[in-house]
Interface confidence: low
């Protein structure tokens, strides 16, 4: 058994666990009773005889049931992510590059290409990458926007990622995407360059499918004023990775206590 | 200063704050070293004069930023969740009422109307719905789809909600989708008939935007022995909330131990 | 993690979650909640070592962080991690009634 | 909530979250840490009263399950609720480096 | 169109509780931080407190007893209550956006209300 | 809390001036450093933050260096409707903010 060296401050003693399932057990108790705001257990005098209600039941069961699309609990932490993770910044390829070229064109869309051999060089393998977040900085929007972003796939095809509503704004705003599982797959295959694309959202019968908003990096012919912040605050790969010395370390004490 | 009942069990003391703060800074000062797997602070010998480059510090505030669209830490439970949650259902008005004529032909999307009389007997006031969840019950689909959700805005126009990606399945499963916020919009207006859509995501520049998922209670001229699902397990609202009267009572003990 | 997986299949003796049972009838004296009969509630138990003081050895004690003291608590303590719901079926006078009560089972625990 | 709000604008004698600011230089006597000068650590402190017993009346102890003991533990404890990260800079060797501290700032605390 | 207008400012006597309201409108409330600032006549700017998106706040030191500050998302209202109002307290009370782009700069003040001119007086 | 110095409290300038205010505070706060013109009536308007970055739309005659603990506001050719009070304000990572207690800007 456990003592601290601070009397003062230690709260583990030799435990009697049947008193703690007592207790427990009388807590749960309270508990229930305090959930449902009763003073005492309810009369049982009125209740019908016989099995509940078909309906009664159906409900309980929908009650019970982990549907698709229903947020389960938040997972506990892994133990991996209770170190610190490095931070690095992956920016995007100018849109000189002629990656862009075949893709200049749409009123709909703008392109985000990424050069992965950078990307590996901040992380070098899939499995050290926690977390990775497209930023984009917003500039002002005048009415609301709702825009889709999509992950280059194969040839011409995008598949599609999330979406969001955007409020107008007189002022810019950084914008952050998770794309965690995005850029773990570019780590894991051989692409020289990857890319996303943010789309206006089109519904089936909506015409008026242009994008209205303004990402900083792709605003041309602007008041002059603005070119200071495009290079520096072009949309941006924020990673955040074990680095890798750390999880070698990690991965030989795979012990448990 | 609190005394326990129980000594056995109570971890409670007269706790000296000075000395509480002292242990919380020496365990900070493990936990940080812990977490960089450091065994001793970094030497700072060949540390380089002056500030710290720009782009480092750009970079630890693009970490410390908090944006658009990334997830904040969760709410703390606030305290009328504590409580118990009273649960009900209303099912979608039935496809042949007259509502539903004027949405019949669409490829793309389905429709579903609720009553909000029925609404209202089951939450009287918007302020104690605590979740509205959609449940559909989707039957066997061949192909992966993404769907989107709307819901009914004004006259014609439809408000996106949500979207899903769903998987290719053999059997009918359930889907679920929060609409909480909706309904508590509903429960505050006059309206008498409430609807959603469900339809296809159309992509700005795709053309295949049907509606492959069949959704019970929406599929006709089928084998019969679907019939009887049917009328049970059409699309309904499953909703929580607080009982009128506990509601009350917790309003009149607003205050703070 | 210290959740029913690792806890119920160990005899770890520091923090962990335990096994309970909890039957309405047996337990509690109850017979008014209709469904469900009883509930695995479980709870948390276990000493969250002190792992820091300044004589310590730095190495020995860093790799202890993680389970004992994650939070850097001055006085670590083991709490419910993960906690689900539970639906009850009861009746107030003739009417049925289903309600969810928050956080009743607890899946994993944690040195907070 | 027993978050900074309540809880340094109060006197609550019972669990809550206490203002701790650490500053890297003078609390831990470190010059590695770059980035920030400190932060506001806080800290989680305070009884959370077992309220129930069998010859305690009902209706007395229920209000209080709330706050004093809502996951119904056996001995509950005062613990951090809401937690949120710190990004660092440090150098190692001459390369500076940013990195993210998990769980490192207490926003709130609660009786678990 | 970004917009904070503070209200509820007037005369009041020493001693007594005052609570301003600023109604914002135009952008995302619930999502930007809030600054409560004032300035006594013909002097500087003095910062009272902040608020957090999720209700956390910071004051001055020299407005911990007496300055509360808390929102209300669902009205877009941030509120400052004072209480035990002393002479020295007459200004013109600002409600300001905290600045966004890098999330530290939350103190730096992007967008302000008109003001609200309280006067402490008997 | 961090104690702002500005100086000087007021000053005399002419159109197309270039001008200069420093602001110095009680302890070094790396660059977490703000600017603000108030002009009578109206509430302040932010010019810089980070000691050197121009707000949005605000005119490139303004420009704002230092870290540490001294830092400077410069306009560097004076315009008519310039003339104001400037302030500058900490927000370093301790437990408060601190304006500076202004400079006036006005005609020579």
């Known amino acids: 058994d456990y003592k601290d060296d601070d009397d003062k401050l230690s709260t583990s003693k030799t435990i009697d666990m049947e008193l703690v399932k007592r207790k427990r057990i009388e807590a749960i108790r309270g508990q229930i009773l305090s959930k449902l705001r009763l003073a005492s257990p309810p009369s049982q005098g009125e209740v019908p005889p016989g099995p509940l209600p078909e309906a009664v039941l159906a409900l309980y069961n929908s009650t019970r049931d982990r549907v698709a699309g229903e947020s389960a609990e938040p997972e506990p932490e892994p133990e991996a992510d209770y170190y610190a993770k490095e931070v690095t910044r992956v920016l995007m390829v100018e849109t000189h590059n002629e990656i862009y070229d075949k893709f200049k064109q749409s009123t709909h869309s703008i392109y985000m290409f990424f050069n992965t051999s950078e990307l590996r060089e901040a992380v070098p393998e899939p499995v050290l990458l926690s977390r990775a977040e497209l930023r984009l900085l917003r500039l002002k929007l005048k009415v609301e926007q709702h825009v889709e972003l999509y992950q280059k796939y194969s040839n011409n095809s995008w598949r599609y990622l999330s979406n969001r509503l955007l409020a107008p704004s007189d002022s810019p705003e950084w914008l952050s995407f998770d794309v965690t599982g995005v850029v773990r797959q570019w780590l894991s295959r051989g692409g020289e360059i990857e890319g996303f694309r943010l789309s206006a959202h089109c519904s089936c019968d909506s015409r008026d499918n242009t994008l209205q908003v303004d990402i900083n990096g792709f605003t041309t012919g602007r008041r002059g004023d603005l070119a200071t912040i495009h290079g520096m605050n072009r949309p941006f790969l924020l990673l955040m990775a074990t680095p890798l010395e750390r999880a070698q370390h990690l991965q030989s004490s795979r012990h448990r206590r | 200063d609190y005394k326990d009942d129980d000594d056995k069990l109570s971890t409670s003391k007269t706790i000296d704050m000075e000395l509480v703060k002292r242990k919380r800074i020496e365990a900070i000062r493990g936990q940080i070293l812990s977490k960089l797997r450091l065994a001793s602070p970094p030497s700072q010998g060949e540390v380089p004069p002056g500030p710290l480059p720009e782009a480092v510090l750009a970079l630890y505030n693009s970490t410390r930023d908090r944006v658009a669209g990334e997830s904040a830490e969760p709410e703390p439970e606030p305290e009328a969740d504590y409580y118990a949650k009273e649960v009900t259902r209303v099912l979608m008005v039935e496809t042949h009422n007259e509502i539903y004529d004027k949405f019949k032909q669409s490829t793309h999307s389905i429709y579903m109307f609720f009553n909000t009389s029925e609404l209202r007997e089951a939450v009287p006031e918007p302020v104690l719905l605590s979740r509205a969840e959609l449940r559909l019950l989707r039957l066997k689909l061949k192909v992966e789809q993404h769907v989107e959700l709307y819901q009914k805005y004004s006259n014609n126009s439809w408000r996106y909600l949500s979207n899903r990606l769903l998987a290719p399945s053999d059997s009918p499963e359930w889907l679920s989708f929060d609409v909480t916020g909706v309904v508590r919009q509903w429960l505050s207006r006059g309206g008498e008939i409430e609807g959603f859509r469900l339809s296809a995501h159309c992509s700005c520049d795709s053309r295949d935007n049907t509606l492959q998922v069949d959704i019970n209670g929406f599929t006709t001229g089928r084998r019969g022995d679907l019939a009887t699902i049917h009328g049970m397990n059409r699309p309904f609202l499953l909703l929580m909330a607080t009982p009128l009267e506990r509601a009350q009572h917790l309003q009149s003990s607003r205050h703070r131990r | 993690a210290l959740d029913t997986n690792y806890c119920f299949s160990s005899t770890e003796k520091n923090c962990c979650v335990r096994q309970l049972y909890i039957d309405f009838r047996k337990d509690l004296g109850w017979k008014w909640i209709h469904e469900p009969k009883g509930y695995h509630a479980n709870f948390c138990l276990g000493p969250c070592p002190y792992i820091w003081s300044l004589d310590t050895q730095y190495s020995k004690v860093l790799a202890l962080y993680n389970q004992h003291n994650p939070g850097a608590s001055a006085a670590p303590c083991c709490v419910p991690q993960a906690l689900e719901p539970l639906p009850i079926v009861y009746y107030v006078g003739r009417k049925p009634k289903v309600e969810q009560l928050s956080n009743m089972i607890v899946r994993s625990c944690k040195c907070s | 909530a027993l978050d900074t709000n309540y809880c340094f604008s109060s006197t609550e004698k019972n669990c809550c979250v206490r203002q701790l600011y650490i500053d890297f230089r003078k609390d831990l006597g470190w010059k590695w840490i770059h980035e920030p000068k400190g932060y506001h650590a806080n800290f989680c402190l305070g009884p959370c009263p077992y309220i129930w017993s069998l010859d305690t009346q009902y209706s007395k102890v229920l209000a209080l399950y709330n706050q004093h003991n809502p996951g119904a533990s056996a001995a509950p404890c005062c613990v951090p609720q809401a937690l949120e990260p710190l990004p660092i800079v440090y150098y190692v060797g001459r390369k500076p480096k940013v990195e993210q501290l998990s769980n490192m700032i207490v926003r709130s605390c609660k009786c678990s | 169109q970004v917009q904070l207008v503070e209200s509820g400012g007037g005369v009041v006597q020493p001693g007594r509780s005052l609570r301003l309201s600023c109604a914002a409108s135009?952008?995302?409330?619930?999502?930007?931080?809030m600054n409560w600032i004032r300035q006594p006549p013909g002097k500087g700017l003095e910062w009272i407190g902040y608020?957090?998106?999720?209700?956390?706040?910071y004051r001055a030191n020299w407005a911990r007893g007496r300055f509360t500050i808390s929102r209300d998302n669902s009205k877009n209202t941030l509120y400052l209550q004072m209480n035990s109002l002393r002479a020295e307290d007459t200004a013109v009370y600002y409600c300001?956006?905290?600045?966004?782009?890098?999330?530290?700069?939350?103190?730096?003040?992007?967008?302000w209300g008109q003001g609200t001119l309280v006067t402490v007086s008997s | 809390d961090i104690q702002m110095t500005q100086s000087p409290s007021s000053l005399s300038a002419s159109v197309g001036d270039r001008v200069t205010i420093t602001c110095q505070a009680s302890?070094?706060?790396?660059?977490?450093l703000a600017w603000y013109q108030q002009k009578p009536g109206q509430p302040p308007k932010l010019l810089i933050y980070?000691?050197?970055t121009l707000e949005w739309g605000v005119p490139s005659r303004f420009s704002g260096s230092g870290s540490g603990t001294d830092f400077t506001l410069t306009i560097s050719s004076l315009q008519p409707e310039d003339f104001a009070t400037y302030y500058c304000?900490?927000?370093?990572?301790?437990?408060?903010?601190?304006f500076g207690q202004g400079t006036k800007v006005e005609i020579k």
């Open positions: 980070a000691a050197s």
């Open positions: 300001a956006r905290g600045w966004h782009i890098f999330g530290h700069h939350y103190w730096v003040m992007h967008f």
């Open positions: 135009g952008f995302h409330f619930s999502s930007e931080a």
């Open positions: 608020i957090y998106t999720s209700g956390t706040t």
């Open positions: 304000q900490s927000y370093s990572d301790g437990d408060s903010v601190g």
């Open positions: 302890q070094s706060i790396s660059t977490y």
